[in-house]
Interface confidence: low
């Protein structure tokens, strides 16, 4: 069977696959996925290895019409370096000489200057070029190579290995050489794979069942460390609870050097965030950190300094901590649409079972703002998802110069942020450089501010506007607000109006219904529009909503019903696959993801049209 890195090299024009008959004869044959001689894989950024011979494709010289054969893999050889050129051409690196089928007289695969159909190759069974199954460096654990990547193939006791092996070991642990010649260099590490005993590479917290892996002997950049964790279905460490920090302080107490964790400020204009998307709600900075020096965007935990955190340049080479298993976050379920009554009092706006209101004009210190919200039957707003934040920004009349209290604060426990309404912290979106929580300023409360509505900590005694939120009431008729530029019953977002079509319809019927409304089945231009639509339909009880995407016109090419390029996709797993059809958005757990359905299935749908007289706020005078 093919493993996921292996592939057959297929020429569509001849409908045949490359076959390594021997190291000196690389020819073609009828494709056979069980034939070892037809299996290849990338073993570096630019080398392709024959699985059967554990030798690499190469040429004797970079000249036209020479035979491509197999050579001992040498990562330094210019004659073994391949690259995908435009479309499905495979060429020797740095030259316009291509991997070519040969001809009637020449059965061997050749290097040739021509770029026609005989020089075009795909992965068998797909429409992808060979680079789509590219090389992924595998970072080692423990061993003696400082976490360096596996070098495939590597030689051990004069035998070549193209995969991790337990050869030479009685414990069954999988290892690899980190240079091509282990026999000479003796450099190795264990592979980040599941094997008998690999669990002992992890420490499990008995209280939370979360596992941690301390790689103190490695020397990787932050991005490499993150990749290493991800290769083990884990992530760089996030710390969201005080208990978790205490446990890790104990776990690392015997170490002295810094270890990468997942905290970073790599987003261009938002603040500190965890790489596993946990909320940044607990702070444990080293005094003087985070320093504001540019480039210091990644964070290490300092075992020698009571496991406190320090921001460093991401290219520094350090050890690192991975984390996997149950998240330390409390589970928190957003109510499903069937639990979401829509009635809100006048001047309050409904979203997912709650009502929201901005108080902009009556400025109050945080404590008084909280009191007012509670008197009105609610609380200062909590925010649990990007969709909820997007709703507040785009639908509540939020303005870019607003600075408004939300319910997040660390009044009860310093450096540990909580929502005033008692709901768990599942999401944060801090402004660049935030939370600053400078020691000389008691910044225990949190505001939303700036064009994006991102968050900053602030002294609680400032008089500011605020946002209240309360559970919506089920009684009473639904209030349908008419949004400016949209007809009654339509919802506005940016330049457009949207409406849910409530009649179960085929794709064609849905399209016609939208057209009758001087609209069209929705297009989705980018992930912001997708986030809006996910919040619009994602919590509804129906399973699918038609979009305007289909490959009815040209099989295999998905197009919108209007003349709009497809510049963004949000496919569900295994989609679009090879089946033709029409595209609908999922609801529920897979909310917003796109599935291909038969076009005559019946589903609800979303119509869209340009808002009337779309205009922006007047340009500010400078």
């Amino acid at each position: 069977l093919l493993d996921t890195r292996q592939f057959l090299i297929y020429n569509e024009d001849h409908k045949r696959c490359v076959d390594a008959v021997s190291p000196s004869a690389v020819q073609t044959a009828a494709c056979n996925q069980d034939a070892e001689s037809q299996k290849f894989r990338w073993v570096s950024e630019s080398q392709i290895m024959s699985v059967a011979f554990k030798l690499c494709l190469g040429v004797p010289s970079k000249t036209d019409w020479v035979a491509i054969t197999l050579y001992a893999c040498d990562s330094k050889s210019e004659f073994q370096k391949w690259e995908c050129k435009n479309d499905t051409l495979l060429g020797i690196k740095g030259e316009d000489l291509f991997f070519n089928y040969g001809n009637r007289q020449e059965k061997n695969i050749m290097l040739y200057k021509g770029s026609g159909l005989w020089s075009r190759w795909k992965i068998y069974g797909t429409t992808d070029n060979l680079c789509s199954r590219g090389y992924e460096a595998m970072y080692t654990l423990l061993g003696n190579a400082n976490g360096a990547t596996c070098a495939f193939p590597f030689k051990f006791e004069n035998k070549w290995y193209a995969d991790c092996t337990s050869a030479g070991r009685s414990d069954g642990w999988l290892w690899c050489g980190t240079t091509t010649d282990y026999d000479t260099d003796k450099l190795f590490g264990y592979c980040p794979l599941k094997f008998e005993g690999s669990e002992s590479l992890w420490n499990k917290d008995p209280l939370t069942s979360v596992s941690y892996q301390i790689n103190s002997k490695s020397a990787l950049t932050w991005h490499q460390a993150r990749k290493s964790c991800q290769q083990q279905n884990a992530e760089l460490l996030s710390i969201t609870e005080i208990h978790e920090q205490t446990y890790l302080t104990g776990l690392t107490s015997s170490l002295t050097s810094g270890l990468w964790i997942g905290l970073n400020s790599l987003s261009f204009n938002s603040g500190w965030q965890w790489s596993d998307r946990s909320p940044f709600r607990y702070l444990n900075w080293l005094p003087g950190s985070p320093s504001a020096e540019p480039g210091k965007s990644c964070v290490s935990l300092n075992p020698g300094k009571n496991a406190k955190w320090e921001n460093l340049e991401c290219v520094q080479k350090l050890g690192y901590i991975c984390k996997k298993g149950n998240t330390t976050l409390n589970s928190f379920v957003i109510p499903s649409e069937s639990d979401v009554p829509t009635h809100c009092p006048s001047q309050w706006w409904p979203y997912a079972g709650h009502c929201y209101k901005i108080h902009r004009d009556e400025k109050k210190i945080q404590r008084d703002a909280l009191t007012t919200c509670r008197k009105e039957g609610g609380d200062l707003t909590s925010i649990h998802t990007i969709e909820e934040l997007d709703f507040i920004i785009s639908q509540l009349g939020y303005e870019p110069n607003d600075e408004l209290w939300i319910g997040l604060n660390d009044i009860k426990i310093q450096m540990y942020f909580e929502w005033s309404d008692g709901t768990p912290v599942t999401f944060t979106k801090w402004l660049r450089g935030e939370p600053s929580h400078e020691n000389n300023r008691q910044e225990d409360c949190v505001v939303m501010k700036g064009k994006d509505g991102y968050w900053a900590d602030r002294g609680c005694e400032w008089p500011l506007g605020y946002i209240c939120k309360m559970k919506s009431r089920s009684q009473g008729p639904e209030i349908v607000e008419v949004e400016k530029g949209c007809r009654k019953g339509w919802k506005k977002h940016h330049f457009y109006c949207y409406m849910i079509g409530h009649t179960l319809s085929t794709f064609a019927e849905a399209n016609q219904t939208c057209n009758n409304e001087n609209a069209y089945l929705t297009t989705i231009e980018d992930r912001y529009e997708q986030a809006f639509l996910t919040s619009f339909v994602g919590l509804r009880p129906e399973k699918y909503f038609w979009t305007g995407l289909s490959d009815i016109q040209t099989k295999g090419t998905f197009q919108w019903t209007i003349e709009e390029e497809v510049r963004f996709t949000h496919w569900n797993s295994d989609m679009p696959g090879r089946k033709p059809g029409c595209v609908a958005m999922r609801t529920g757990i897979a909310g917003g993801l796109w599935d291909v359905l038969k076009c005559d299935e019946k589903a609800k749908f979303v119509c869209k049209h340009w808002a009337e007289g779309v205009t922006h706020p007047p340009k500010p005078t400078t």
């Epitope: 987003s267 261009f268 204009n269 938002s270 997007d390 920004i393 064009k451 994006d452 940016h494 330049f495 297009t523 231009e525 980018d526 912001y528 919108w560 209007i562 003349e563 709009e564 390029e565 497809v566 510049r567 922006h616 706020p617």
Partner: nanobody, 121 residues
């Protein structure tokens, strides 16, 4: 920050043509909708035409059939071809773009400084 630079404005006779250009520069990650607005003296700013990155267009009723908006995504540039110009088209024309400066940021709205179009005999 994203900057928008308009050009192509000027004085033209009724029935004449002009082509406005607007180029976006600066730390752009992606630009979604680009458009033209205009503001005549003493009047509110109004949408003239807009175009999405995918090529979908929208026009004010008063310019349909006379003005054509187009866009070069590679150059982050939008054009407004104005034909059969009328005196009532006289205004300052502003370029507008919904841009984003990083992959995980919401769109922000940007304006150019404006270019004067005068239609008069």
């Amino acid at each position: 920050q994203v900057q928008l630079q308009e050009s192509g404005g000027g004085l033209v006779q009724p029935g004449g043509s002009l082509k406005l250009s607007c180029a976006a520069s600066g730390s752009i990650f992606s630009i979604k909708t680009m458009g033209w607005y205009r503001q005549a003296p003493g009047k509110q700013r109004e949408l003239v035409a807009a175009i999405t990155s995918g090529g979908s267009t929208n026009y004010a009723d008063s310019v349909k059939g006379r003005f054509t908006i187009s866009r070069d995504n590679a150059k982050n540039t939008v054009y407004l071809q104005m034909n059969s110009l009328k005196p009532e088209d006289t205004a300052v024309y502003y370029c507008n773009a919904d841009g984003v400066v990083a992959w995980d940021q919401p769109y922000d709205n940007y304006w150019g400084q404006g270019t004067q179009v005068t239609v008069s005999s």
